[in-house]
């Protein structure tokens, strides 16, 4: 067991390799192109280390001439993956990430998959489908979510520190009960943020404090019993 005055509790969510997808069911595919896309661009938060499947507009593949995936990642040249139906050929330009691939053969499935999403996959993904009736687009602003590691410890008399380390986006920290708090944020080069909240409780009937960390990947609460004030021996409550 750790010493109460040192780090008391830590938590790091463990995720089995889950898959997330915004793709439509085949039954939803429609020939009515004018009603296909209610929303051309979608913001899509995806947890790191999961698998993601991105879809083209729901257009029957038999109506297709060319499918192009355009991938714009931060600090990298634009990557394109194209499939030309007539010649059954695929072509890639400036694509170096082997985790971003077609789900299967593009003549059978136009979807794109990202295996084991990483922070570097933050970016914009767009499928362009060229058909005899015109071009149809679907874009994704992919936001990679990173679960912060949460720690709670005491460092001084009736003072506790709660940290949400390397989360993306930044976590929000609140306390029960409210104390006299100062919060700092530290930004890392990989896009993650560490939030540190330091609180002091002067009120002596506060026994245990709870740090509540809110994050898009889920919420976490930790609690710790405050140490007595040095020299304090006996009090009635």
């Amino acid at each position: 067991q750790p010493n109460n005055s040192l780090m008391l509790q830590t938590s790091k969510e463990n995720h089995a390799l889950a898959s997330s997808s915004l793709c439509m069911d085949e039954k939803q595919i429609t020939q009515n192109y004018s009603k296909v896309l209610a929303e051309v661009n979608t913001s899509w938060p995806v947890k790191m280390a999961t698998n993601a499947v991105l879809c083209c507009p729901p257009i029957a593949l038999r109506n297709l001439i060319i499918i192009t995936w355009e991938i714009i990642l931060r600090g990298q040249p634009s990557c394109t993956k194209a499939y030309k139906k007539e010649t059954n050929e695929t072509k890639e330009t400036n694509c170096t990430d082997e985790r971003i691939t077609w789900v299967s053969r593009p003549d059978q499935n136009s979807d794109l998959q990202i295996r084991t999403v990483a922070i570097t996959h933050d970016g914009y993904y767009r499928c362009i489908m060229v058909t005899p009736d015109g071009n149809f687009h679907r874009g994704y602003h992919l936001q990679v979510l990173v679960t912060p590691e949460v720690t709670l410890f005491q460092n001084r008399n009736r003072t506790a520190v709660c940290k949400a380390v390397a989360g993306k986006p930044a976590a929000h920290i609140s306390w029960i009960p409210e104390g006299d708090c100062a919060t700092k944020q530290e930004y890392w080069s990989n896009g993650t943020v560490t939030v540190k909240s330091t609180c002091h409780w002067e009120v002596h009937n506060v026994s245990t404090v709870t740090c509540h960390v809110s994050h898009l990947t889920g919420n976490k609460s930790l609690y710790i019993e405050l140490l007595p004030v040095p020299g304090a021996k006996k009090s009635a409550k």
Epitope: N205, P228, K237
Partner: antibody, heavy 114, light 107 residues
Amino acid sequence: QVQLVQSGAEVKKPGASVKVSCKASGHTFTSYWMHWVRQAPGQGLEWIGNIYPGSGSINYDEKFQGRVTMTVDTSTSTAYMELSSLRSEDTAVYYCLTMTGTSWGRGTLVTVSS
Amino acid sequence: DVQMTQSPSSLSVSVGDRVTMTCQASQGTPINLHWFQQKPGKAPKLLISGASNLEDGVPSRFSGSRYGTAFTLTISSLQDEDIATYFCLQFTYIPWTFGQGTKLEIK
């Protein structure tokens, strides 16, 4: 795995004192508050007080102030709760608990009867 | 002192029922709490720590949640062995205070 082993049942006369012990293992005894609560037959639970073994700091509920004494022996990782001037309404099961109330002893039945 | 109001005080139930009980702190004071199960002659058993964390070995039919300053313990599908008294303990303020308990009885 934290374990709290309490002393055996006691029968006391009104006006007497009782001292219940609670021996802890499986955690750093001096780093966690030890609390004492009691439960009268068929009743709810009530908090008596707590002691921090690392410093001897104590909080008592006002209801028990003047009648209760909590002590620790850090060499044996044992906490003690002594209640004096016993009356029949002190008949209850007394529990020690630690780790912010997540680890409990099995309880000690104290019967006060003339 | 923070008073914990627990409701209902008793509940007549059948196997398979979904059972819910609530604890609320006086004056809507923000607190944290644990949920316990107690059977006659036994020490309380911790089910849920810190309002919503299921303890190791506790069946997943038990769950705890917080709605503002109200706390709920839910048994999704009651089993025979769940017949007991349940109570909450607030551990944010001294003195620690307990709910009066919810006693489950078979119909």
